[in-house]
Interface confidence: low
């Protein structure tokens, strides 16, 4: 691994030589310091590929965490950067150097070398946590094939800076709870699991809290085994709709399938006053189905333009693959246009919607 951004050292950098393997170096840094840990190869010989680990979880390079083969830099350190750091040989996982790092709230003494105007935190924005990128958190159900990498993200802010923890099915979730471990990335707003397996299925909750409050977000992970199964349809879709006469309506259906799915939109109809046939199968008409030039994305949306009262009723999204079928239904209610309501009212009728 190469450092890539070797010159990005700001503020006070305390370079610490690595202890003998087996020893633990105790280090204290001030808030805002640049923590720099050095781990030269034992005996000066070649070291081979290495990984830096904090509290049992592999560190991933970022603009703040600069990872090199023999050196680790953590810029603008905060309390959350306290912990047990080690440099390990990638292949053998042998610990080459081990450091215990504590970051205190008070900045350590020493002049700022980068000339940066450090504005005081006046505490004006003191408050409970909030999501900083809610648009990045809209995917509540993640259905991925086995062996893929999954990332859940909960970018948040608050003052004081909130902490984040992760739960799986309501219980504390840590790296040692799964083979392959987990990665907490970028100020720990993300949880990454590589090479997911069926046992990783479940509900993952990020809990972001400070002394003023707590917010949480739950994601559902489904791992699609290579032994294929019928399509999965996202819960709550399509959703029931109410529309005014003459308006446009869209129904959405999100399909997850390892095997190639075939998607159809159906409308339930009556035949001779009956909604189902003699065998109990509903009467339907196919509104939309795969064609030569239709993409799955297009099929996941059913658009109805200039709706009439005849368009009211039950709609079904049907998805099938080589294994089987899944379907979700929703209802469309069509209301009269406002002018019609007014006219009816003037004529002495009452419309109860």
């Amino acid at each position: 691994e190469s450092l890539g951004t070797e010159q990005r050292v700001v503020g006070r950098a305390a370079e610490v030589p690595g202890p003998e393997p087996g020893q633990q170096e105790q280090l204290v840094f001030g808030s805002g310091d640049a923590v720099e840990l050095s781990c030269p190869p034992p005996g000066g010989g070649p070291m081979g590929p290495t990984v830096w680990v904090k509290d049992g979880t592999g560190l991933v390079p970022s603009e703040r965490v600069l990872v090199g083969p023999q050196r680790l830099q953590v810029l603008n350190a905060s309390h959350e950067d306290s912990g047990a750091y080690s440099c390990r040989q990638r292949l053998t996982q042998r610990v080459l150097c081990h450091f215990s790092v504590r970051v205190t709230d008070a900045p350590s003494s020493g002049d700022d070398e980068d000339g940066e105007d450090e504005a005081e935190d006046t505490g004006v924005d003191t408050g409970a946590p909030y999501w900083t990128r809610p648009e990045r958190m809209d995917k509540k159900l993640l259905a991925v094939p086995a062996a893929n990498t999954v990332r859940f993200r909960c970018p948040a802010a608050g003052n004081p800076t909130p902490s984040i923890s992760w739960l799986k099915n309501g219980r504390e979730f840590r790296g040692e709870h799964r083979i392959g471990g987990i990665k907490l990335r970028h100020q720990q707003w993300s949880l990454v699991m590589e090479s997911v397996v069926p046992s990783d299925r479940g509900n993952y909750t990020c809990v972001v809290e400070n002394k003023f409050g707590s917010i949480r977000q739950t994601y559902t992970l489904d791992v699609l085994e290579r032994s294929p199964h019928r399509p999965i349809l996202q819960a709550g879709l399509p959703a029931n709709q109410t529309a005014v006469l003459g308006s446009d309506v869209e129904f959405h259906c999100k399909v997850y399938s390892d095997a190639q799915p075939h998607i159809q939109w159906l409308k339930h109809v009556e035949v001779n006053g009956s909604k189902v046939g003699p065998d109990g199968t509903p009467y339907v008409t196919v509104l939309k189905t795969a064609g030569a030039n239709t993409t799955d994305k297009e099929l996941e949306v059913l658009s109805l333009h200039n709706v009439t009262f005849e368009d009211a009723g039950e709609y079904t999204c049907l998805a099938g693959n080589s294994i089987g079928f899944s379907h979700h239904s929703a209802w469309l209610v069509v209301l009269p246009a406002e002018e019609e309501l007014v006219e009816a009212d003037e004529a002495g009728s009452v419309y109860a919607g």
Epitope: S62, D114, D117, E118, K139, T149, R151
Partner: antibody, heavy 120, light 112 residues
């Protein structure tokens, strides 16, 4: 060495669509957000939007909402920007650029740019 | 949207002289929790793609000469070239990344 290599120049008629590609190499594609920025002749830089290649999640500048579509193909480490209903004022150099994901960062690498000319 | 306003539009400087470019944001880009200003400066030479010079308002990107420096906090920022060289002829843009992304209009630096 990180590289963002963009597709070649395009000439389009008003009302048409254009799709520009941006192939990333030298780093893990899914560890970054890909942003698109354009620059009309003799003008400044204008942010179009960004995509997280891992989840496909996108953000757009209000001006381009509904007209720009950002996509990414993880298998080829390629990001795409499609702009529809082209007008003459869309004539510009379109750049892809990247930032670290998960938190706002500056744009540290840029593609070479793709000139899109809209003319009848 | 946060609006970024740069001044001046253009600047003619003698070689070796100091050049100062100002950038004002319509709202603060300082995030009090981490005391960072979400502001970057870019350099764009004629016929080239923009290049990142400074991020977090004052941190120089790797490989950028130390004659370039950034300062300021909140809504008012400055890019300073302490001793302008011929290769510094370019358009300079400020950009906020506090809320989505917006750029300033650019400042053209020329040699007198």
């Amino acid at each position: 060495q990180v590289q963002l290599v963009q597709s070649g120049a395009e000439v389009k008629k008003p009302g048409a669509s254009v799709k520009v590609s941006c192939k990333a190499s030298g780093d893990t594609f899914t560890d970054f957000e890909i942003h698109w920025v354009r620059q009309a002749p003799g003008q400044g830089l204008e942010w179009i939007g960004d995509i997280d290649p891992e989840t496909g999640s996108t953000s757009y500048a209000q001006k381009f909402q509904g007209r720009a579509t950002l996509t990414a193909d993880r298998s080829t480490s390629t990001a795409y920007m499609e702009l529809s209903s082209l007008r003459s004022e869309d004539t510009a150099v379109y750049y892809c650029t990247r930032t670290y994901d998960g938190y706002p960062y500056a744009m540290d690498y840029w593609g070479q740019g793709t000139l899109v000319t809209v003319s009848s | 949207d946060i609006v970024m306003t740069q001044s001046p539009d253009s600047l003619a400087v003698s070689l070796g002289e100091r050049a100062t470019i100002n950038c004002k944001s319509s709202q603060s880009v300082l995030y009090s929790n981490n005391n960072k200003n979400y502001l970057a400066w870019y350099q764009q030479k004629p016929g080239q793609s923009p290049k990142l010079l400074i991020y977090w308002a004052s941190t120089r990107e790797s490989g950028v000469p130390d004659r370039f420096s950034g300062s300021g906090s909140g809504t008012d920022f400055t890019l300073t070239i302490s001793s302008v060289q011929a290769e510094d002829v370019a358009v300079y843009y400020c950009q906020q990344y506090y809320s989505y992304r917006t750029f300033g209009g650019g400042t053209k630096v020329e040699i007198k």
